[in-house]
């Protein structure tokens, strides 16, 4: 039920990467506006983005105050111009969308090296630790602080004159891995989730190489 | 329920080829890197490789580089292990396994392979 | 690459008994090493992970310790069903690599 000239939004889809959360929905408004409500389980609802023509709502702000909290959220429509109207139950159209658990399921973003230093026979690659917008004591956390031991980052390396990859594995965000001397590496990585079961891995960091800026070799 | 199901396993002359399948059921094999294994008779287990579905990426023990080749159809969600020039030392059992990233968490039943003119 | 030394490679123990196996890595594994156990005809089953983690649904007499190169795994009492063939894996780095099997047999 609901006004003749307002239409239930549909297709609600949670889109979070790092905890970054927004949550899109469709059609496109002819006629209509939107607002958004957010809750927990068992908390209230608070409403976001007001009579809105966007589809879509950032709702990070809300979700990292508790990223291991389970989240629902619901699109309603007002006719444009007339945001008092209701339906004919005496309450504005809405949908529900799915249930969202961030730490459960936000996606991980694409990974960064952010240095290697070659000592010897040994290359320290340093995977860049990303901010998120999870607070703590005024503080933006990392990726690390959020996940702690439950991330795990791969390292795929191969040397630039062979296609033969190895691979290493870290639960911080360093590696110290074997190297044969006079000999440049290539470096990827990718973040890992072991404890989930979607959404598990990101993609792959953009591909390094030894011989390039990022790097440093010191000959010990 | 999650479910690794190896199968092409049988007898095969020296040099000859041979194609492994593990087919998973209650997973999508992308979500996870996955593994084969191998165990001759009265032997110790040895690793031959690992396949990131996702992205194909494959890691080798070395001494299998170049003659195994995995691979994975995530469509049919599927893991395949190509055995090319086989010699009587590759009579064992292939088993396909699925890594969380902390550990091995299941595996095939096994399928086997005899390498023999 | 890293070699894994487990030891013993057989061992005899009664019904009750604590059972001790060791794994000795090349280099540091950072304790990435899982403990399997392996019954005949049978696919390995995970016991422990991330040297001193107990998978789910294994009974506490299994226990693994160790960091570094020096792994142990320990049975505290020792129970007829046991009887099987243990292994030691590292995946830190590849290849991977196991150990070469403890057989457990009871006396």
């Known amino acids: 039920s609901g006004t003749t000239n307002t239409v239930a939004a549909y297709n609600l889809t949670w889109k979070s990467t790092n905890f970054k959360t927004i949550l899109e929905w469709e059609p496109k408004p002819v006629n209509q506006v939107y607002t958004v409500q957010i809750s927990t389980k068992s908390g209230d609802w608070k409403s976001k983005c007001f009579y809105t023509t966007d589809t879509e709502c950032d709702l990070t702000d809300e979700i990292v105050k508790d990223v291991k909290q389970t989240y629902l959220a619901r699109v309603f429509s007002y006719p444009a111009g007339n945001v008092e109207s209701t339906g004919s139950a005496g309450e504005p159209l809405y949908e529900n969308s799915p249930e969202f658990t961030p730490y459960l399921e936000t996606n991980l973003g694409q990974p960064t090296i952010q240095s290697f230093e070659q000592v010897g026979t040994k290359v320290n690659v340093t995977v860049e630790d990303e901010r998120t917008l999870v607070r703590r004591n005024n503080t933006f956390l990392s990726l690390r602080d959020v996940f702690g031991k439950d991330l795990i980052y791969t390292l795929y390396y191969w040397k630039s004159s062979s296609s033969g990859k190895k691979t290493a594995k870290t639960n911080t965000n360093e590696f110290l891995i074997d190297v044969d001397k006079g000999e440049n590496y290539c470096f990827s990585v990718q973040a890992v989730i072991p404890s989930r079961t979607v959404n598990r891995k990101s993609t792959d960091s953009p591909v390094e190489c030894m011989g390039q800026e990022k790097g440093e070799f010191r000959e010990i | 329920q999650v479910q690794l199901v190896e199968s092409g396993g049988g007898v095969v002359q020296p040099g000859r080829s041979l194609r492994l399948s593990c087919k998973a059921s209650?997973?999508?094999?992308?979500?996870?890197?996955m593994h084969w294994v191998r165990q001759a008779c009265g032997k110790g287990l040895e690793w031959i490789g690992l396949i990131d579905p996702e992205n194909g990426n494959t890691i080798y023990d070395p001494k299998f580089q170049g003659r195994f080749t995995i691979s994975a159809d995530n469509s049919k969600n599927t893991l395949f292990l190509q055995m090319d020039s086989l010699r009587p030392e590759d009579t064992a059992v292939y088993y396909c396994?699925?890594?969380?990233?902390?550990?091995?968490?299941?595996w095939g039943q096994g399928t086997p392979v005899t390498v023999s003119s | 690459d890293i070699q894994m030394t487990q030891s013993p490679s057989s061992l005899s123990a009664s019904v009750g008994d604590r059972v001790t196996i060791t794994c000795k890595a090349s280099?540091?594994?950072?304790?990435?090493l899982n403990w399997y156990q392996q019954k005949p005809g049978k696919a390995p089953k995970l016991l422990i992970y991330?040297?001193?983690s107990l998978a789910d649904g294994v009974p506490s007499r299994f226990s693994g310790s160790g960091s570094g190169t020096d792994y142990t795994f320990t049975i505290s009492s020792l129970q007829p069903e046991d009887i099987a063939t243990y292994y030691c894996l590292q995946h830190g780095e590849s290849p991977y690599t196991f150990g070469q099997g403890t057989k457990l047999e009871i006396t």
């Open positions: 280099q540091d594994i950072r304790k990435y």
């Open positions: 209650g997973f999508n094999i992308k979500d996870y890197y």
């Open positions: 991330y040297a001193t």
């Open positions: 396994a699925r890594d969380n990233s902390y550990y091995f968490d299941y």
